[in-house]
Each structure stands twice: as C-alpha cells, then as structure tokens.
C-alpha cells in the first residue's frame, strides 16, 4: 500500500527474489510515516515490505551482493 | 514446536570437506530460514551462512565465501552445511539455527551441535 | 559488516547481583538486536529480541535496551542458573554478527 511515493503498509505475501529487480529504503524520518523496503519487480510494480522481517533482509542482502558484483 | 536435529560427530583429514545436516520437523520448513553458525573449542558464536529453502539460494559470510555451500532439500525438511579445504582452524561445533522467514528474529531454534574435528 | 563490541569480556558476581553488559555496534543497527545466553556444551537460547522484547518463557528478571549502536542487557537480580555466556547478536543486515561474549562466573 502506497500513496504519493510513500508506504502505507506492508504486503502480506512473500516475494521470490527472482521476481525483484532492485529495491529503495523508506525511512520514517523523511517524510514518510513509517520505515519500509519497496521492493520493485520485473512487472514494474513497487511493493511495500516490512524491513524487520527476515526473508526482506535476506533479499536486500542479496540484491545488494548482486549490485557489489557488477 | 519446530525441532532441528543434526547428524552426528565427524573427524576429518586436512584439506577434506565435511557435510552436515540438519533436519527440522514440527513446523513448515519452507516458512523458515536456516542459519550455520559456529563455534571453536572456548570461542564465541560465528555466523557462517544460510538459506530460506523457498528461495533456493544461499547467502554466506564473505569469510566462508566459496569454501561454504548451504543447500536445502525440502522433500525431507532438511538442511546441509558443507565446508570444503577443511584446516585444524575448522575444528568447532557447528550449530544449525532457524527462525520464521516472517519473522522478525533469525534464531529462534537451534539444533544441538555438530563437532568436526579437524585433524592429521 | 557491522561489528559488535561487547564489554566486559567477563564479569564475577553474586546470587542477587544487579548485572550489565553493552554491546556497540560500529554502524546503526535500529532495534535489531538480539541477547542470548549459552551454557557449557548447550546451544545458545534466545532471551531478548528487538532490543527490548522478552522472548516468550524467559524470566523478566532479564531486560534489554537501546536503539542506535548502544545496546545494553540487564540481570535484574542474578539466579544460580544464569551463570552463563551471553552474546549480543545484530540481524539489521547480512552478514549477521555476534559480539564477542561476556562470560559472567559466580564470586
């Protein structure tokens, strides 16, 4: 769920990583009200995640090893 | 209550590998992650890698990097650990941990320990 | 990888002891850190999470805070059985990290 580029909400659903093409931070202290992970797909859609949640963490890891080895 | 069970004790020569495993069961394994950590004889805790079954691909730290491979065969719930170019330095128990990939802590179970040891 | 500093490496203290131990990471690592404690030959146990949550079967007697890169866990009043190793762990981001432990032994 988002509005005006900012996550209001977290998805409910598990995302595979073969299906994500890259990701941005939201952080709560600029100007939006909460900090998430918007993961974005190859269907070019933005999903909103929560950053807290193990399997979020374990794909940010690997999308940022992915970007490293470029 | 989800239980991992490891293989048992090894002792290996220099410059082999060891593969271990570990096997959960009481809960939905492919709802979970599965961490290897280690530790050395009177040593802390070493996070070495894992794997969230469902994705399939294992993420590792970069001092095990291409000497550690992580897999997970979902048919049977179980988790492998193999470490290859083994040295006296590898002698450890080797802990497999697991928490729910939608959940906010990596290591809510652990398995009891595997000791490798390393040695001519 | 964010490195974890914890202190002291070792501490002795009575039954009914007050105990702390910190642990700084060298980045910002949120709330996302975690305390367990390990007794000889036994696999580590989860006591607190989140920084500050207690894990669910854990005595309050065992408190965590801290936010940032300054974490600190407390004893509130120390039992025979919490003679132990305990281990701050951050899972902010990958790699995930452990400080180095704080081994506490009866005075």
């Known amino acids: 769920a988002s509005n005006f580029d900012c996550c209001l909400g977290y998805t409910d659903r598990i995302l595979h990583p073969k299906f994500i093409v890259g990701f941005t931070r939201q952080l709560a202290n600029e100007g939006c009200d909460i900090n998430a992970i918007i993961f974005h797909t190859k269907k070019k859609l933005s999903v909103c995640a929560n950053p807290k949640q193990t399997w979020v963490k374990y794909i940010v890891r690997l999308l940022s090893k992915k970007v490293k080895n470029m | 209550q989800v239980q991992l069970v490891q293989s048992g004790a090894e002792v290996k020569k220099p410059g082999s590998s060891v593969k271990v495993s570990c096997k959960a069961s009481g809960g939905t394994f492919s709802s979970y992650a599965i961490s290897w950590v280690r530790q050395a004889p009177g040593q802390g805790l070493e996070w070495m890698g894992g794997?969230?079954?469902?994705?399939?691909?294992?993420n590792y730290a970069q001092k095990f990097q291409g000497r550690v491979t992580i897999t997970a065969d979902e048919s049977t719930s179980t988790a492998y650990m193999e470490l290859s170019s083994l040295r006296s330095e590898d002698t450890a128990v080797y802990y497999c941990?697991?928490?729910?990939?939608?959940?906010?802590?990596?290591?809510?179970?652990w398995g009891r320990g595997t000791l490798v040891t390393v040695s001519s | 990888a964010i490195q974890l500093t914890q202190s002291p490496s070792s501490l002795t203290a009575s039954v009914g002891d007050r105990v702390t131990i910190t642990c700084r990471a060298s980045q910002f690592a949120s709330n996302d850190v975690g305390w367990y404690q390990q007794k000889p030959g036994k696999a580590p146990k989860l006591l607190i999470y989140?920084?500050?949550s207690l894990q669910s079967g854990v005595p309050p007697r065992f408190s965590g805070s801290g936010s940032g890169t300054e974490f600190t866990f407390t004893i509130s009043s120390l039992q025979p059985e919490d003679f132990a190793t305990y281990y701050c762990l951050q899972d902010y981001t990958y790699p995930l990290t452990f400080g180095q432990g704080t081994k506490v032994e009866i005075k």
């Open positions: 989140a920084a500050s």
């Open positions: 941990a697991g928490g729910s990939i939608t959940g906010t802590t990596p290591f809510d179970y």
């Open positions: 794997i969230i079954p469902i994705f399939g691909t294992a």
